[in-house]
Amino acid sequence: MDNYADLSDTELTTLLRRYNIPHGPVVGSTRRLYEKKIFEYETQRRRLSPPSSSAASSYSFSDLNSTRGDADMYDLPKKEDALLYQSKGYNDDYYEESYFTTRTYGEPESAGPSRAVRQSVTSFPDADAFHHQVHDDDLLSSSEEECKDRERPMYGRDSAYQSITHYRPVSASRSSLDLSYYPTSSSTSFMSSSSSSSSWLTRRAIRPENRAPGAGLGQDRQVPLWGQLLLFLVFVIVLFFIYHFMQAEEGNPF
């Protein structure tokens, strides 16, 4: 889809249904919420293989818009996705906005809320903190780290993230939300107001990443199941023979 803004409300509803994304009526005040859901869904479904380095340097908004040529990059919608949405307690009237580890980078001091429901997450106490750069590597080294983030209730003033969970009627108009209807962070978004949990759709890689040849040979090597059974069998037989000979010795001391 080159431009979701060109879709009619009915067409957008069809797309939401195709992706198994629960939704209410698509109207002006909720349209961006659903566009954001679609963006999130497509990002989640996109395969893990990163683009080549040469291509990465030339990505543009038009690349972002285009999914027509990327059909093979997405898996088909799965039932599990719908279940994931349902398990979050979504219905047509309210969406839970669980903004785990909402991070704001370079946010100016004393800034108010930037897009309505998203509160200003960070207020830097001084100029040095304002220019402070938080590196991704420092924030998260793995998806396990992200899960830990959810368990931490709140962070200090200089921290760039905090958890926000609240409910909001989907039909709320943007004007009633102080012109900032669309949260931009949640771990939040560039233009959005949907339920954006940072990782509730994220799947872990089934296989660990390839290791360098020879890495972890020794301590990581495991005995196969048949080998374990064989060892167990030998152990049982040895015990049996020990028991047998002990019995024989008791019965015949000479």
Partner: nanobody, 120 residues
Framework: QVQLVESGGGLAQPGGSLSLSCAAS????????MGWYRQAPGKKRELVAD???????NYADSVKGRFTISRDNAKTTIYLQMNSLKPEDTAVYYC??????????????WGQGTQVTVST
């Protein structure tokens, strides 16, 4: 991460025009939308205009018909064309980008800000 570099701004007379631009670099593939916010002294930061990568635009009521937000597909840059400027448009204008990744979820990025002053 996403880096945002703003340019433009400066001094303009009431009724005049100014143009702002904001170039995104880094993990631009994850960007969902980009926009402009402004913060006048002693006031809360407010949305001016924004544009999603799907093409949807949104404007604050106070700038509708005077400001236009657009983007350059090739350079991943957004522009804010400000016409019929008023003294109340005086503020620091911040570029803003929202991105989504599997690992970090939704993240908001901010530029350093550029001053716009409308005065006679």
């Amino acid at each position: 991460q996403v880096q945002l570099v703003e340019s433009g701004g400066g001094l303009a007379q009431p009724g005049g025009s100014l143009s702002l631009s904001c170039a995104a670099s880094g993990d631009i593939f994850s960007i969902y939308a980009m926009g402009w916010y402004r913060q006048a002294p002693g006031k809360k930061r407010e949305l001016v205009a924004d544009i999603t990568n799907y093409g949807s635009t949104n404007y604050a009521d106070s700038v509708k018909g005077r400001f236009t937000i657009s983007r350059d597909n090739a350079k991943t840059t957004i522009y804010l064309q400000m016409n019929s400027l008023k003294p109340e448009d005086t503020a620091v204008y911040y570029c803003n980008a929202d991105s989504y990744s599997k690992l970090r979820g939704w993240v908001v990025y901010w530029g350093q800000g550029t001053q716009v002053t409308v005065s006679t």
